[in-house]
Interface confidence: medium
Amino acid sequence: GITIPRNPGCPNSEDKNFPRTVMVNLNIHNRNTNTNPKRSSDYYNRSTSPWNLHRNEDPERYPSVIWEAKCRHLGCINADGNVDYHMNSVPIQQEILVLRREPPHCPNSFRLEKILVSVGCTCVTPIVHHVA
Amino acid sequence: GITIPRNPGCPNSEDKNFPRTVMVNLNIHNRNTNTNPKRSSDYYNRSTSPWNLHRNEDPERYPSVIWEAKCRHLGCINADGNVDYHMNSVPIQQEILVLRREPPHCPNSFRLEKILVSVGCTCVTPIVHHVA
């Protein structure tokens, strides 16, 4: 197997004071077959609240690439193909878990991190505030 | 918290032959302030492709609770508040990382797993297949 040189500052799995640490097997069980969101569907183009997918890359995170949705319009596309500003395109957000090296550069030590990502957009009726 | 009975077959964190594992600190660094999807927005009710949020709970998984979106209608809500079947409500899916206890009931041993979840719904123009 691989022997990775140990960083002297890396936590030791035998350290009983190492906070809330678990062993994680890296043989990922993947229940999905298609992992590229751009190929998995064309909803981002066909939606009445279309969006673009932006590549968010961070080599020190797992997964290193996360796709972020940005709504194309403030309004929504109507039946004529025009933007209707009486409706709003809004991002649907999801909190996801990622792994980040901690301490940095330790090959076998990570911390869980929660980040909020925009997955796609939906068309909503706006909240109208009436001024008396 | 929940105390899970220890499975006698749980791998030992001191076992140097434990296959392809890393140490993961579960003290999550959370960059977000709001973690309840039902409170984070009311888009699921105001959308032209509204959805219900279903609680998917699995004590053998981390996080144990995941919210799954199910579109309320096949069609989309039009300006009159009726369902328009010339348009389609479709789920927006996202691949997320979870930790699965392995072997089951081991408090400190997990396997990485990728699962596909529906985060919300969007309204799309249907793909119409014309028969010659």
Epitope: I2, I4, L26, E57, P59, E60, P63, S64, N108 | V22
Partner: nanobody, 119 residues
Framework: EVQLVESGGGLVQPGGSLRLSCAAS????????MYWVRQAPGKGLEWVAN????????YYVDSVKGRFTISRDNAKNSLFLQMNSLRAEDTAVYYC????????????WGQGTLVTVSS
């Protein structure tokens, strides 16, 4: 879009040498560890070698140690595998892959280049 294109495969006699190349684009090449993996006919994917971002650390599967050398040129976004003293059991499709921070994990790989070692 991430692209990895391997080249340099071919037919070689036992004991011979080959140099595989991989041209990378669509990502920050110098920020990622890179891998060579291979798939022999009718077998699963096998990790062969990997190299850290700056080229300072290299790791090899036991069966190729002393015979194969992995290297990279970050200025040219290129990965290489120098294969010497080739054996029949090295016959496989060789893929270059972009690494993730988790050990032995990669998220993109190329179309592969076939190496056949036969007399």
């Amino acid at each position: 879009e991430v692209q990895l294109v391997e080249s340099g495969g071919g037919l070689v006699q036992p004991g011979g040498s080959l140099r595989l190349s991989c041209a990378a684009s669509g990502f920050t090449f110098s920020s990622y560890s890179m891998y060579w993996v291979r798939q022999a006919p009718g077998k699963g994917l096998e990790w062969v070698a990997n190299i850290k971002q700056d080229g300072s650390e290299k790791y090899y599967v036991d069966s190729v140690k002393g015979r194969f050398t992995i290297s990279r040129d970050n200025a040219k976004n290129s990965l290489f595998l120098q294969m010497n003293s080739l054996r029949a059991e090295d016959t496989a499709v060789y893929y270059c892959a972009k690494g993730e921070i988790l050990p032995l994990h990669f998220d993109y790989w190329g179309q592969g280049t076939l190496v056949t070692v036969s007399s």
